[in-house]
């Protein structure tokens, strides 16, 4: 079906991956579609097959090289097209001139760990994964802590407006189980968005010392 509402969105992870999602209302699940990448100043062309992720959306990853290799720069433009098979020919369903550093979404932060925990506070650190050296320190983070009896959506967001890969959580309740998540975003790019949330890190505050005021 051609007349359904379509959407084609791609993000660059800043190193060697462009991830794309194509959605179209009313499209047939068994339609064969692919994303074709044609850079303006590189010798390679790349194609990935769009695979269904839900009733009306498909996704694929253009893997440009080794995970930590810097495959694109701020001056690159990659023309991305969604091509769907119609009989014996391929039809262009969507097209964009993709500017990688205007469309960034980094990988979720990794290696979350508790550096130090007390009764009322906890120091947590993390690392960023596959992030370009071009950013230098131009990154920001959001973090959230899941308290007992609440949902992630209710958790207040803590904003770190600089490249700070640690946080000291305070005013915690003693002897309580918490979970913590963090995400990262470069400051660069008109269409840049937050990374996925990290895997949650579970930790427990220390119990209050007996006979002491808490």
């Amino acid at each position: 079906a051609v007349n359904g509402t379509s959407q084609f969105t791609c993000f660059y992870n800043s190193r060697a991956n462009i991830s794309c999602v194509w959605s179209q209302d009313g499209a047939l699940q068994d339609t064969s579609c692919q994303v074709h990448a044609w850079p303006d100043r590189r010798r390679w062309n790349q194609t990935c097959e769009l695979l269904p992720v839900s009733q009306a959306s498909w996704a694929c990853n253009l893997i440009l090289g080794a995970p930590d290799s810097q495959k694109l720069t701020t001056v690159d433009i990659v023309t991305l097209r969604v091509l769907c098979r119609e009989g014996v020919r391929w039809r262009v369903m969507a097209i964009q001139d993709f500017k990688p550093f205007e469309n960034l979404r980094l990988m979720a932060p990794i290696s979350l760990q508790v550096v130090h925990v007390e009764t009322h506070r906890c120091n947590i650190s993390w690392e960023i994964s596959q992030a370009s050296h071009y950013f230098e320190r131009h990154l920001e983070f959001e973090a959230r802590t899941l308290s007992p009896g609440h949902t992630w959506e209710e958790a207040p967001l803590l904003t770190l407006k600089q490249k700070q890969e640690w946080i000291c959580l305070e005013t915690l309740t003693p002897d309580t189980q918490y979970e913590f998540q963090v995400r990262v975003k470069p400051l660069q790019g008109e269409f840049t968005t937050w990374s996925p949330w990290s895997q949650p890190l579970a930790f427990r505050t220390k119990p209050a010392a007996l006979g002491k005021d808490t």
Partner: nanobody, 126 residues
Framework: QVQLVESGGGLVQAGRSLGLSCAAS????????MSWVRQAPGKGLEWVSS????????HYADSVKGRFTISRDNAKNTLYLQMNSLKPEDTAVYYC???????????????????RGPGTQVTVSS
């Protein structure tokens, strides 16, 4: 705020050429796909042509294919439409339009624009 201003329209004889321009401001021009649409007297809006942000992809309505050429100069924030072998049925108000993202959809190219200029009148006499 986004501004699009068309120019270059006028009265021309059939078979002749005319070039339209659209000066854009208020947004990062080369981050967005652009298009030309037109409205003939007493008719609805008709999509004419679209172009990607860097100008590497273009599409045309069958009615203008081979006669019209869309282009852009991102250094000048300007969109162009070169119209050759004009016909009386090309008579219309021509509008340039900005897509809401860097993407456009060739099967439904009229969809997805969020701003349009005031238009410029093109009249083709026989």
């Amino acid at each position: 705020q986004v501004q699009l201003v068309e120019s270059g329209g006028g009265l021309v004889q059939a078979g002749r050429s005319l070039g339209l321009s659209c000066a854009a401001s208020g947004f990062t021009f080369d981050n967005y796909a652009m298009s030309w649409v037109r409205q003939a007297p007493g008719k609805g809006l008709e999509w004419v042509s679209s172009i990607t942000g860097a100008g590497r992809g273009t599409h045309y309505a069958d009615s203008v294919k081979g006669r019209f050429t869309i282009s852009r100069d991102n250094a000048k924030n300007t969109l162009y439409l070169q119209m050759n072998s004009l016909k009386p049925e090309d008579t219309a108000v021509y509008y340039c339009a900005k897509y809401s993202s860097s993407t456009y959809y060739p099967p439904t190219p009229a969809r997805g624009t969020d701003y349009r200029g005031p238009g410029t009148q093109v009249t083709v006499s026989s």
